[in-house]
């Protein structure tokens, strides 16, 4: 058999064709349905990867392999039966048709076929062994997968329990937060209620204060009115006396109505004929704004505008910048006229400043400055003084050159400390300097060794607090 070839027929069955002399023998073998061809993309080690395959996938593949095994077994059985059947048929045919001398050939062919069958069987056995190997390997991988799956399941369970715990904790905290929110809301409501109550109280107090202020204003006005009436009466009396003393006057005896004139200072009031001490209404320079001031119409020729007075400690002089700016107190008693008015006034023309002092031993002294003025608020109402004379010390107790004005809330002094806080009162402090006429008022027998008292160093020294002080101004050309 010099020509033996294997090929496929049109319907896909394997053909074994044997040519022997003039005879050719064709054996048709059935093809395996479920066997993969060598060209199949299936790779035996494809399952060996780092990441474990899905459990279901592994099971499926195992089922496929089992099917293939079963099919192979069936195929082998079929092949055996088929070969046996064919052999029988062939033998019968050979016996019937073939010449006796063909027997050997047939036997040879049979032997060849048997050999081929044996070869096929061996091959199938190999395949079977490979399949078993693969199956074992897959079983191992499956075991690994199931282990890792168990591990993952355990981890998932752990994480789930952890999540549950966290959720429990979360819900507990949420409850707590909600409780706190409720508490907070209640507290806020109570605070709001308290606030409302306080506001009601404050508004009540404000209205009471307003009423009291109105009453004070009314009282002050009444007082001023009474003083003015007294002043007018005095003037009327003076006029009457003048009229009576004038013999055979042809003038009408009726008193003419006083013209409404605005006065810039007490000197103008004095020059207009008002020569009685008292409270007068002055007008700010170049303005209609008015201020009440006490006018001394007797001392040293009169016409003095009182800008400060201390006499009994009835007024607190530890005041704010604003209060010292606009003035405070009672013009008929202790008071501060106001820095703004004094600044504007003393910048209009040249003024003199006289400071009158009293101690507790019945002594009096004064300091007279022939030129005095205050700078504007922008320059902190700095004091400017020239030409000191008088009995209250040969050296000025107001530091020279002049200092800026300082208050408890406006520290413009030269001390590391706040002199206004240290010594009390608003003043032209240095560091802190030799005077403070706005210091604490100390009564008799408590007035020595008081460094925060009413001080005028160059008359009474460091720790002596004075009994009374008056600061007054008047135009230099009066």
């Amino acid at each position: 058999y010099n020509n033996f070839r294997k090929s496929m027929d049109s319907i896909g069955k394997k053909q074994y064709q044997v040519q022997h002399g003039s005879c050719s023998y064709t054996f048709l073998l059935p093809e395996m349905d479920n066997c993969r061809s060598s060209s199949s993309p299936y790779v035996s080690n494809a399952v060996q990867r780092d990441a474990p395959l899905e459990y279901d996938d592994s099971v499926q593949r195992l089922q496929v392999l089992e099917n293939i095994m079963e099919n192979n077994t069936q195929w082998l059985m079929k092949l055996e039966n088929y070969i046996q059947d064919n052999m029988k048929k062939e033998m019968v045919e050979i016996q019937q048709n073939a010449v006796q001398n063909q027997t050997a050939v047939m036997i040879e062919i049979g032997t060849n076929l048997l050999n081929q069958t044996a070869e096929q069987t061996r091959k199938l056995t190999d395949v079977e062994a490979q399949v078993l190997n693969q199956t074992t390997r897959l079983e191992l991988q499956l075991l690994e997968h199931s282990l890792s799956t168990n591990k993952l399941e355990k981890q998932i369970l752990d994480q789930t329990s952890e999540i549950n715990k966290l959720q429990d904790k979360n819900s507990f905290l949420e409850k707590k937060v909600l409780a706190m929110e409720d508490k907070h809301i209640i507290q806020l409501q109570s605070i709001k209620e308290e606030k409302d109550q306080l506001q009601v109280l404050v508004s009540k107090q404000n209205s009471i204060i307003e009423e009291l202020e109105k009453k004070i204003v009314t009282a002050t006005v009444n007082n001023s009115v009474l003083q003015k009436q007294q002043h007018d009466l005095m003037e009327t009396v003076n006029n009457l006396l003048t009229m009576m003393s004038t013999s055979n006057s042809a003038k009408d005896p009726t008193v003419a109505k006083e013209e409404q004139i605005s006065f810039r200072d007490c000197a103008e009031v004095f020059k207009s004929g008002h020569t009685t001490n008292g409270i007068y209404t002055l007008t700010f320079p170049n303005s209609t704004e008015e201020i009440k001031a006490y006018c001394d119409m007797e001392a040293g020729g009169g016409g003095w505008t009182i800008i400060q007075r201390r006499e009994d400690g009835s007024v607190d002089f530890q005041r704010t910048w604003k209060e010292y700016k606009v003035g405070f107190g009672n013009p008929s008693g202790e008071y501060w006229l106001g820095n703004e008015f004094v600044s504007q006034l003393t910048n209009q023309q040249r003024y003199v400043l006289k400071i009158h002092l009293k101690d507790w031993e019945g002594n009096e002294a004064y300091s007279l400055y022939e030129h005095f003025y205050l700078s504007s608020e922008e320059l902190n109402y700095r004091i400017h003084l020239k030409g000191l004379t008088g009995t209250a010390g040969k050296i000025s107790s107001i530091s020279q050159p002049g200092n800026d004005f300082s208050t408890k809330d406006g520290d413009n002094d030269k001390c590391i400390c706040k002199c206004s806080q240290m010594l009390t009162g608003g003043w032209w402090f240095d560091a802190c300097g030799p005077s403070n006429l706005n210091g604490m008022y100390y009564p008799q027998r408590q007035n020595t060794n008081k460094f925060n008292g009413i001080k005028w160093y160059y008359w009474k020294g460091s720790g002596y607090s004075l009994k009374a002080t008056t600061m007054m101004i008047r135009p230099a050309d009066f």
Partner: antibody, heavy 121, light 107 residues
């Protein structure tokens, strides 16, 4: 430099008086107040009073009022402190010190070396 | 009179240590507080005035703070020459008063 030099140690009998001096140099004597402070053995510092050399003004601690007198001699720039009716508890080191400010008795920036006064029978 | 209470009454420290001395006034004294250093047999020496201002020539390791009633003297890094007794002094109110001292000793 600014200096305060005090007189030497004194031993006195109870009921007697002592006068301690303090000579100033290196600054204008009348420009600063002078204070006197004492320190009894193992005790706190105690302020006795001050004198203003400019005008002779004085201020005493009530504890010593009537027993103490402070004076100055501006011609020699010397301050004096006299303590009368001495008792054994007056045994102390007596210091003179200059105040930093003429117009106020603030803090004390220059001190004398101290004078030990012992009161013993 | 205003009482000045110093604490501690003594402190043991080594060179380079940070030492803090406190002084409490019995009433508000604003910032009118001075600190003095006194060595045995010597007169007190002014260190700090107005609670926090160092006097001329005083090393920067000395610092003061406080206002009202509570005051502190701090030595940031103790030097051999700093072993002494330290006194606080209020001059806000008459009569001026002193604390009874804090002795800084070598450990």
């Amino acid at each position: 430099q600014v200096q305060l030099v005090q007189s030497g140690a004194e031993v006195k009998k109870p009921g007697a008086s002592v006068k301690v001096s303090c000579k100033a140099s290196g600054y204008s004597f009348t420009d600063y107040n002078m204070v006197w402070v004492r320190q009894a053995p193992g005790q706190c510092l105690e302020w006795m009073g001050y004198i203003d050399p400019y005008n002779g003004g004085t201020g005493y601690n009530q504890k010593f009022e009537g027993r103490v007198t402070m004076t100055t001699d501006t011609s020699t720039s010397t301050a004096y402190m006299e303590l009368r009716s001495l008792r054994s508890d007056d045994t102390a080191v007596y210091y003179c010190a200059r105040t930093r400010d003429r117009y106020d008795v603030w803090y004390f920036d220059v001190w004398g070396q101290g004078t030990l006064v012992t009161v013993s029978s | 009179d205003i009482q000045m209470t110093q604490s501690p009454s003594s402190v043991s420290a080594s060179v380079g240590d940070r030492v803090t001395i406190t002084c409490k006034a019995s009433q508000d004294v604003y910032i009118a507080v001075a600190w003095y250093q006194q060595k045995p047999g010597k007169a007190p020496k002014l260190l700090i005035y107005w609670a926090s201002t160092r006097d001329t020539g005083v090393p920067s390791r000395f610092s003061g703070s406080g206002s009202g009633t509570d005051f502190t003297l701090t030595i940031s890094s103790l030097q051999p020459e700093d072993f002494a007794t330290y006194y606080c002094h209020q001059y806000s109110s008459y009569p001026p008063t002193f604390g009874c001292g804090t002795k800084v000793e070598i450990k």
